[in-house]
C-alpha cells in the first residue's frame, strides 16, 4: 500500500469516488474526490514488477496451492481416522490456505490488467482480509503444530480425545482472533481511483489520513502479537525438540524420526525466512516511512515481500508431508497416479515381512497410521 493523496477540497474524506454521472470530458471522467500518487509509486503500479512478476508468482501459488491444500484437507477430514492435534492443526492450516488461494484468480487478473480492480469494493475487502488472515492464521497454526510436535516428544502418552478437543478449541480461538484482528481490513475502503493512471487500485493505494497513524499502529501490533511472539514460541519448540532428539537413543526408527523432524524444522524455517519475516518487517517499515516522510522508499520491496508471503500456501504441503503419514501416502500416490487401495494391496503381498519388523506407528496403511513422531 502506498500513500494516496486526497485532493478533495471538501476536506480529507476517506472515500475516493469516481462520479461517472458528472461532467464527462471526452474519454475521461470527472472525479469528485481524487487521490494522487508520487512518480515512483506510479512507476511500480504500471511497471513489470506488479503487472508481470506478481501474476506469475500468484499463478504458481494458485496452481500448486489449490490442489495440494485441497487434497490435504480431504485427507485430514476423510482419510485420517484418528484426529490427533497435529491433524487438526494441519487441517486448519490447509483450510486457511484454501480460503486465501481461491481468490487468487481475481488477484492475478487485477495485476495483469495493470492493477485495475473491476470487481467492486466488497470483493476487494474480502480478498485483502483473507490475504492477511491467511498469513496470520498460518503463523498461529504453525506455532500450534510446532509446540504440539515438541509436546509429543516430551510427553508421548496422553489422553488422545482430550488432546483433540483442546486442539479444536485452540483452532476455533485462532479463527475468532484472526476474524477480530482483520476486521479493520474489511471495514476500511480499499479501492481507490487514481486519475493519473486511470486505474482503481485494491489495497495498493490507501488514503493518506488512514495510513499516517492507523495502518502503522495496526501492522506494528500484528507484527509483535501475531508474528514475533508466535515466532519465538516456534523457535523455542524446535530448539527444545532438537535437544530432545539429540539426547535420545539412536535406533533405526528414532533416526528416521530425527531426519523427518529436521526436514520439518528446515521447512518451517524456510517459511519464516521467505514468507513471514520479510512481509511483517516490511509492512512495519513501509508504514513507518509513510507516517514519518509521507512516502515509502521500500514500496517495491514491500510489494515483493507481500507477494512472497503467499508462497506459504505452497510450502505448507511440505509440512503436511513431513508430519502426516496419510498425506505422505496420498501425495506419493497422487503424483504417481496410483490409488491408495492398489498400493496397499501391493504392500500387503510384497512387503509383509519387511512391515513386521517396523514399528506399528510407521505402518504404511493410510487408514491406521499415527501422525505423531
Amino acid at each position: 500500500t502506498i500513500q494516496g493523496t486526497n485532493r478533495s477540497s471538501k476536506g480529507r474524506s476517506l472515500i475516493g469516488k469516481v462520479d461517472g454521472t458528472s461532467h464527462v470530458t471526452g474519454k475521461g471522467v470527472t472525479v469528485e474526490t481524487v487521490f494522487s500518487v508520487d512518480e515512483f509509486s506510479a512507476s511500480v503500479l504500471t511497471g513489470k514488477l506488479t503487472t508481470v512478476f506478481l501474476p506469475i508468482v500468484y499463478t504458481i501459488v494458485f496452481v500448486v496451492g489449490l490442489p495440494s491444500n485441497g487434497m490435504a484437507l480431504w485427507v485430514f477430514l476423510f482419510r485420517t481416522k484418528k484426529k490427533h492435534p497435529a491433524v487438526i492443526y494441519m487441517a486448519n492450516l490447509a483450510l486457511a490456505d484454501l480460503l486465501s488461494v481461491i481468490w487468487f484468480p481475481l488477484k492475478i487478473a487485477y495485476h495483469i490488467h495493470g492493477n485495475n480492480w473491476i470487481y467492486g469494493e466488497a470483493l476487494c475487502n474480502v480478498l485483502i482480509g483473507f490475504f492477511y488472515g491467511n498469513m496470520y492464521c498460518s503463523i498461529l497454526f504453525m506455532t500450534c503444530l510446532s509446540v504440539q510436535r515438541y509436546w509429543v516428544i516430551v510427553n508421548p502418552m496422553g489422553h488422545s480425545r482430550k488432546k483433540a478437543n483442546i486442539a479444536i478449541g485452540i483452532s476455533l480461538a485462532i479463527w475468532l482472533l484472526i476474524l477480530l484482528v482483520t476486521i479493520p481490513l474489511y471495514v476500511v475502503k480499499q479501492t481507490i481511483f487514481i486519475p493519473a493512471l486511470n486505474i482503481t487500485t485494491c489495497h495498493d493505494v490507501l488514503p493518506e489520513q488512514l495510513l499516517v497513524g492507523d495502518m502503522f499502529n495496526y501492522f506494528l501490533s500484528l507484527a509483535i502479537g501475531v508474528f514475533l511472539f508466535p515466532a519465538f514460541l516456534t523457535a523455542s519448540a524446535y530448539v527444545l525438540m532438537i535437544r530432545m532428539l539429540r539426547s535420545s537413543a539412536m535406533d533405526e526408527n528414532s533416526e528416521k524420526k530425527r531426519k523427518r523432524a529436521i526436514k520439518l524444522i528446515v521447512t518451517v524455517l524456510a517459511m519464516y525466512l521467505i514468507c513471514f519475516t520479510p512481509s511483517n518487517l516490511l509492512l512495519v517499515v513501509h508504514y513507518f516511512l509513510i507516517k514519518s516522510q509521507g512516502q515509502s522508499h521500500v514500496y517495491a520491496l514491500y510489494i515483493v515481500a507481500l507477494c512472497l508471503s503467499t508462497l506459504n500456501s505452497c510450502i505448507d504441503p511440505f509440512v503436511y508431508y513431513f508430519v502426516s503419514h496419510d498425506f505422505r501416502d496420498h501425495a506419493k500416490n497422487a503424483l504417481l497416479c496410483r490409488s491408495v487401495r492398489t498400493v496397499k494391496q501391493m504392500q500387503v503381498s510384497l512387503t509383509s515381512k519387511k512391515h513386521s519388523r517396523k514399528s506399528s506407528s510407521y505402518s504404511s496403511s493410510s487408514t491406521t497410521v499415527k501422525t505423531s513422531y
Epitope: 486526497n6 478533495s8 472525479v31
Partner: antibody, heavy 119, light 106 residues
Amino acid sequence: QVQLVQSGAEVKKPGSSVKVSCKASGFSLSSYGVIWVRQAPGQGLEWMGVIWGNGNTYYAQKFQGRVTITADESTSTAYMELSSLRSEDTAVYYCARWRGYKDYPFDYWGQGTLVTVSS
Amino acid sequence: EIVLTQSPATLSLSPGERATLSCRASQNIYKYLDWYQQKPGQAPRLLIYNTNSLATGIPARFSGSGSGRDFTLTISSLEPEDFAVYYCLQHNSGWTFGGGTKVEIK
C-alpha cells in the same frame, strides 16, 4: 522548448460563459496534466482544476458545476470553460503544466488571460 | 482543507540582504511544498519544489527548508530582480496556495 500560450483577454457579461484556451508546445498533452489557476486583481492565487493526460478531470469544490476543463490532443490545446459568470470572476486565468504525480510541481505556466465580467 | 499561512505579509529589505520567508501549514504536509515567484503582470515562476529542490534555471541563492508544517524560503543575497511576491503551494492534500509575501525594496 516547453511553452504554454493562452488566448487573449475577454470581456463578458454576468451570467454568460467564457472559454479560455491554452496551447501547449514542446510536450505532449497525453503525458502531462494541465492545471488552471486564477488570480483576482490584487489578490492571491487560487487553484481551480486539473485535466490529466488521459482525460480525467478534477475541480476544486468552489468551482464544481461551473467549470469544465477539456483538452484536444490533435491541436495540443487545453480549455477551461467557466459558466454563470459573476463580477467576482473577474481575474487573470493561468494554465500550467503538471506531470500528474504527487511529487511534481507546476513547472511551466501560460502568460495568463484576463477575463473581465462587467454589465 | 489545508490552510497555508505566509509571514510576513510584506518584507522590506535592501539589495544584498538575506531574505527569510515563512510558510506554515495547518497540518502535516511532509515535504510537499513548492515556492513560486510572481512579478507584476507576469505569470508565477517555479523556484523550489518538494521543500528544497531547486527548479531548473533558478539561481543558487534561492533555497528551501523545513518539513511537516513549517517551511522557509531563503534568498541568501537579494538581487534587484528578486523583489516580487512569493507564494507557497502545498500539494500533499489538495492544492492550496499561501496568501503571499511581498518582498519590497527598503
